[in-house]
């Protein structure tokens, strides 16, 4: 059996085995964001669809109020894409005129809130300066990596400006995690 | 065994276990695209290398005619990167002259075709406005996420303009999926 | 049990099973880079933090001198994000004056070095032309895909210009791999 040496007379188990199909997993998709209060110097968190369309949570991975709740300690692959869109005019002209164009940048952060640490931990950040030529611009920021999480940890996606998030299609803006 | 209570006298198996090494997996790499007919208002699909160089398919995951064929129901991680390259001149000038620059945008879509649904399902989309300053531009769009797929589903990668896809190197443009 | 048919009287094992928790895994995070000599026409390799903060290596996956060392043959998901930042002035003006702006592009390559092959193999490349409007720019390049690796293979991340890498935060620039 996997995780143990092959031996005809005995078996030495090094670690417990578990079925892949019962591992905590979630894929959340974008919904229209209702403006919520957030504290100064803190990026607002997105909320998500968790059961309609392509979205799902399974095997005790639950979603509630902006957070993915980690039901079991282990190594998780966590990912998100946020598609931003906005309107700008020629940046350099605005800069020359001394009026910085909004936004100067777009940022996505996947954040962990954990019981064993007093402050939120930024796991992943994608940040991009934006000074587009032309009136309408749109672009995605994608993030994904593996992290060791503890039972009870909470994950959220924060963005620099919630009003720039493209919430029109579930395939453009999403957030997911699965236990490896 | 994990996924069950520890009990000395019996074991209650909740889900079948399976070896990781026999799970369906594929990594496909770019090849030069031959222009193919595609329906109006539908992005053309890329075709792929499936056995030379870094490319492979294994454990009943097959590639045929632009499609990855899903041999077994389950949760899959699906990913793709498409590198685009093109030539543009100063966008704002072109816009002012009333001639929108081509392309206005570049888009990648990972699409699922399933027997049980008449329309293809867009699983993932990466879309970016392009109005580059300077004569030559190039950039990748990366996508990746987890989806529940059914045996017999087919996956493809569609792009907004096949002529802009960089097919020169297998590490620049690729498409893959694996059962979790 | 996984990888075998359920049968009350006998069990047919198709492949060895192994516990997920004992698979080789690593997530490395950025550190300040010390300029190192590298060969002409070869991109310099980044070095990484492997144990502090979010970084870890486990289950015989080791990091040494810019390389992740693969301890066991199998299929690995490999990923990296590099955030670049720099300063530029209006590109088109510079181009018109015949002085190409530096950088013309930013590139990340995940490279495999293997004993059985004399040349390094480029597994993944993300490359983007850069000619930003505005004085300060920053942006990430993300890569991730699955590859079949052999015990003893070494992985590294190369970049086109090490001086442009944002080393300020562990969530902005990172590199990881895990056995599937």
């Amino acid at each position: 059996l996997k995780g143990q040496e092959f031996a005809p007379s005995h078996q030495q188990v090094y670690a417990p085995l578990r079925a892949d199909g019962d591992k905590p997993r979630a894929h959340l998709t974008v919904v229209r964001q209702t403006p919520t209060q957030h504290f100064k110097n803190q990026f607002p968190a997105l909320h998500w669809e968790h059961e309609l369309g392509l979205a799902f949570t399974k095997n005790r991975m639950n979603y509630t109020n902006k957070f993915l709740l980690i039901p079991e300690s282990g190594d998780y692959f966590i990912y998100s894409q946020v598609t931003f869109r906005g309107m700008t005019s020629e940046c350099s002209e605005i800069r020359q005129a001394g009026r910085p164009n909004k936004p100067d940048s777009i940022t996505v952060v996947i954040t962990k809130v954990t019981d064993s640490y007093p402050e939120p931990t930024q796991l992943l950040m994608g940040t991009k300066s934006v000074c587009e030529v032309g009136s309408n611009w749109f672009q995605p920021i994608y993030l994904g990596a593996m992290f060791s999480l503890q039972e009870g940890d909470k994950l959220m996606v924060n963005v620099s400006d919630i009003s720039l998030v493209d919430y029109t299609k579930e395939d453009k803006t999403f957030f997911g995690a699965f236990l490896l | 065994l994990k996924g069950q209570e520890f009990a000395p006298s019996h074991q209650q198996v909740y889900a079948p276990l399976r070896a990781d090494g026999d799970k369906p997996r594929a990594h496909l790499t770019v090849v030069r695209q031959t222009p193919t007919q595609h329906f109006k208002n539908q992005f053309p699909a890329l075709h792929w290398e499936h056995e030379l160089g870094l490319a492979f398919t294994k454990n009943r995951m097959n590639y045929t005619n632009k499609f990855l064929l899903i041999p077994e129901s389950g949760d899959y991680f699906i990913y793709s990167q498409v590198t685009f390259r093109g030539m543009t001149s100063e966008c704002s000038e072109i816009r002012q002259a009333g001639r929108p620059n081509k392309p206005d945008s570049i888009t990648v879509v990972i699409t699922k075709v399933t027997d049980s649904y008449p329309e293809p399902t867009q699983l993932l989309m990466g879309t970016k406005s392009v109005c580059e300053v300077g004569s030559n531009w190039f950039q990748p769009i990366y996508l990746g996420a987890m989806f529940s797929l059914q045996e017999g589903d087919k996956l493809m990668v569609n792009v907004s303009d096949i002529s802009l896809v960089d097919y020169t190197k297998e590490d620049k443009t690729f498409f893959g999926a694996f059962l979790l | 049990l996984k990888g075998q048919e359920f049968a009350p009287s006998h069990q047919q094992v198709y492949a060895p099973l192994r516990a997920d928790g004992d698979k080789p895994r690593a997530h490395l995070t950025v550190v300040r880079q010390t300029p190192t000599q590298h060969f002409k026409n070869q991109f310099p390799a980044l070095h990484w933090e492997h144990e502090l903060g979010l970084a870890f290596t486990k289950n015989r996956m080791n990091y040494t001198n810019k390389f992740l060392l693969i301890p066991e043959s199998g299929d690995y998901f490999i990923y990296s994000q590099v955030t670049f930042r720099g300063m530029t002035s209006e590109c088109s003006e510079i181009r018109q004056a015949g002085r190409p702006n530096k950088p013309d592009s930013i590139t990340v390559v995940i490279t495999k070095v293997t004993d059985s092959y004399p040349e390094p193999t480029q597994l993944l490349m993300g490359t983007k032309s850069v000619c930003e409007v505005g004085s300060n720019w920053f942006q990430p390049i993300y890569l991730g895909a699955m590859f079949s690796l052999q015990e003893g293979d070494k992985l590294m991340v190369n970049v086109s210009d090490i001086s442009l890498v944002d080393y300020t935060k562990e969530d902005k620039t990172f590199f990881g791999a895990f056995l599937l």
Partner: antibody, heavy 116, light 106 residues
């Protein structure tokens, strides 16, 4: 500014249930974890348990588990503590503590005396 | 339970002295926290994650250590530092505090 305010009766009869409420202002409790810690006279600090307000999941000190219940009301941004079957040994200052979503914030404490 | 053994239980030092308090966990922990409590007040977080200074805390306070052995240091004792100091581990269930170290001025 984040503030935590404990409230509840200062005197509880033996064998009765001690009930305290912690009201948080300036921060959404869903974004944190809320703990209760007590300090008996002349003694050190004792962690009683915590709740994740987002999910309602709780963890308790095993030494108190049979008697302690922590709940939350996210609409009021409040968490509550109930300690049943109290004795004189439960006389203490009870603190609610917010952590995880922001640097540790403690309430000022509520002295509860168990006496007949 | 993870037992936290703090020493000394009390100490007396002069203004400007370097003061060191140790805390030993009965098993390895990843994160250690240090609190200051003045009479009649709620504890205040000084150090988190073994060595990170909480916001607004003077730089004369520091923490170090890993695994089972942790140290809290006041590099130059000030009159306002008179208080009881507690270590706490936040990983095992239950969370446990050290018994406290009372710091006085000579």
């Amino acid at each position: 500014q984040v503030q935590l305010q404990e409230s509840g009766p200062g005197l509880v009869r033996p064998s009765q249930t001690l009930s305290l409420t912690c009201t948080v202002s300036g921060f959404d409790i869903d974004d944190t974890y809320m703990h209760w810690v007590r300090q008996r006279p002349g003694r050190g600090l004792e962690w009683m348990g915590r709740i994740d307000p987002a999910s309602g999941h709780t963890k308790y000190n095993p030494s108190l588990k049979s008697r302690v219940t922590i709940t939350r009301d996210t609409s009021k941004n409040q968490v509550s503590l109930r300690l049943s079957s109290v004795t004189a040994a439960d006389t203490a200052v009870y603190y609610c503590v917010m952590s995880g979503g922001a640097p540790d914030v403690w309430g000022q404490g509520s002295l509860v005396t168990v006496s007949s | 339970d993870i037992q936290m053994t703090q020493s000394p239980s009390s100490l007396s030092a002069s203004v400007g002295d370097r003061v060191t308090i140790t805390c030993r966990a009965s098993q390895g922990v990843m994160y250690m926290y240090w609190y200051q409590q003045k009479p009649g007040k709620a504890p205040k977080l000084l150090i988190y994650g073994a060595s990170n200074l909480a916001s607004g805390v003077p730089s004369r306070f520091s923490g170090s250590g890993s695994g089972t052995d942790f140290t809290f240091t006041i590099s130059s004792l000030q009159p306002e530092d008179i208080a009881t100091y507690y270590c706490q581990q936040w990983e095992g269930n239950p969370r446990t505090f050290g018994q406290g170290t009372k710091v006085e001025i000579k």
